[in-house]
Interface confidence: low
């Protein structure tokens, strides 16, 4: 059964997938697809790497980590309900039927709307200007000042994203690592 990951509408979703290259720069092709992993390849490919680089991508899908070190975790930016479903991370190890296949279930929840706080200083205390998630990969930083005309719904979304990002990082810390070679 697939592992389940959650995000709210408007957030960035994180789907972890890792392997350990046999040697630095000795990369294994990887594909990400929407839908469960088929017998070969990936269906509905959203992103693909080869032995050297990312050679195919589609809008909103990022490799935020250092894929040259085997972090091929997928970030989906600004998710909608339509992004819900199973995603396949396929590590295409050379040889017949050697591929490592991971099915990850993404559940998108509607964004919560919370009532406006009564005092501005409550917001300032609760939300520092710079909010950075912890993890092995590159920092993903939400900078309130960089969001134009931020409203209270967005602030609520950021709060929930912080909570979910901590969960995501905990999952990332305990994620399986595949060693190649």
């Amino acid at each position: 059964s697939e592992v389940e990951y959650r995000a709210e509408v408007g957030q960035n979703a994180y789907l972890p997938c890792f392997y350990t290259p046999a040697a630095p720069g000795n990369l294994v092709p990887v594909c990400w697809g929407k839908g469960a992993c088929p017998v070969f390849e990936c269906g509905n490919v959203v992103l693909r790497t080869d032995e050297r680089d990312v050679n195919y991508w589609t809008s909103r899908y990022w490799l935020n980590g250092d894929f040259r070190k085997g972090d091929v975790s997928l970030t989906i930016e600004n998710v909608t309900l339509a992004d819900s479903g199973i995603y396949c991370c396929r590590i295409q190890i050379p040889g017949i039927m050697n591929d490592e296949k991971f099915n990850l279930k993404l559940v998108i929840k509607p964004a919560k709307v919370t009532p406006a706080p009564t005092r501005q200083r409550d917001f300032t205390a609760a939300f520092p200007r710079m909010l950075t998630t912890r993890g092995h990969g590159p920092a993903e930083t939400q900078t309130l000042g960089s969001l134009p005309d931020i409203n209270l719904t967005q602030i609520s979304t950021l709060a929930n994203e912080l909570r979910d990002s901590r969960l995501a990082n905990d999952l990332r810390d305990s994620g399986a690592t595949i060693r190649i070679g």
């Epitope: 790497t49 894929f67 930016e77």
Partner: nanobody
Framework: QVQLQESGGGLVQTGDSLRLSCVVS????????MGWFRQAPGKEREFVSA????????VYADSVKGRFTISRDNAKNAVYLQMGSLKPGDTAVYYC??????????????????WGQGTQVTVSS
């Protein structure tokens, strides 16, 4: 024709700060992933930092994480790199780059279609 123009480089001492700016003209700035790369003498051009179109995702090379901060101002068609706690190893020509995508690998030079001419940053000990 998309053009990128960097500024803000110079000679500084170890531990100092510097802010680089890059202004984009001739294109729809909001559609671009913006990145900073650097190239030291005799070395390959390397990834420093990048930011997606909305500013919601930032990525840093391990060597600059915690010292450098990338930001962008879509109203001014500008991207910035605030560099702190500079070291002699940060000496390089710094390039601003734009990728007309909102996905892909932000660390790869090949992802970026548009480049500035570069600005020299020299950190003396």
């Amino acid at each position: 024709q998309v053009q990128l123009q960097e500024s803000g480089g110079g000679l500084v001492q170890t531990g100092d700060s510097l802010r680089l700016s890059c202004v984009v003209s001739g294109g729809t700035f909001r559609n671009y992933v913006m990145g900073w790369f650097r190239q030291a003498p005799g070395k390959e051009r390397e990834f420093v930092s990048a930011m997606n179109w909305s500013g919601g995702i930032t990525v840093y090379a391990d060597s600059v994480k915690g010292r450098f901060t990338i930001s962008r101002d879509n109203a001014k068609n500008a991207v910035y790199l605030q560099m702190g706690s500079l070291k002699p190893g940060d000496t390089a020509v710094y390039y601003c780059a734009a990728a007309a995508i909102d996905g892909g690998t932000v660390r790869s030079i090949n992802s970026y279609a548009y480049w500035g001419q570069g600005t020299q940053v020299t950190v003396s000990s």
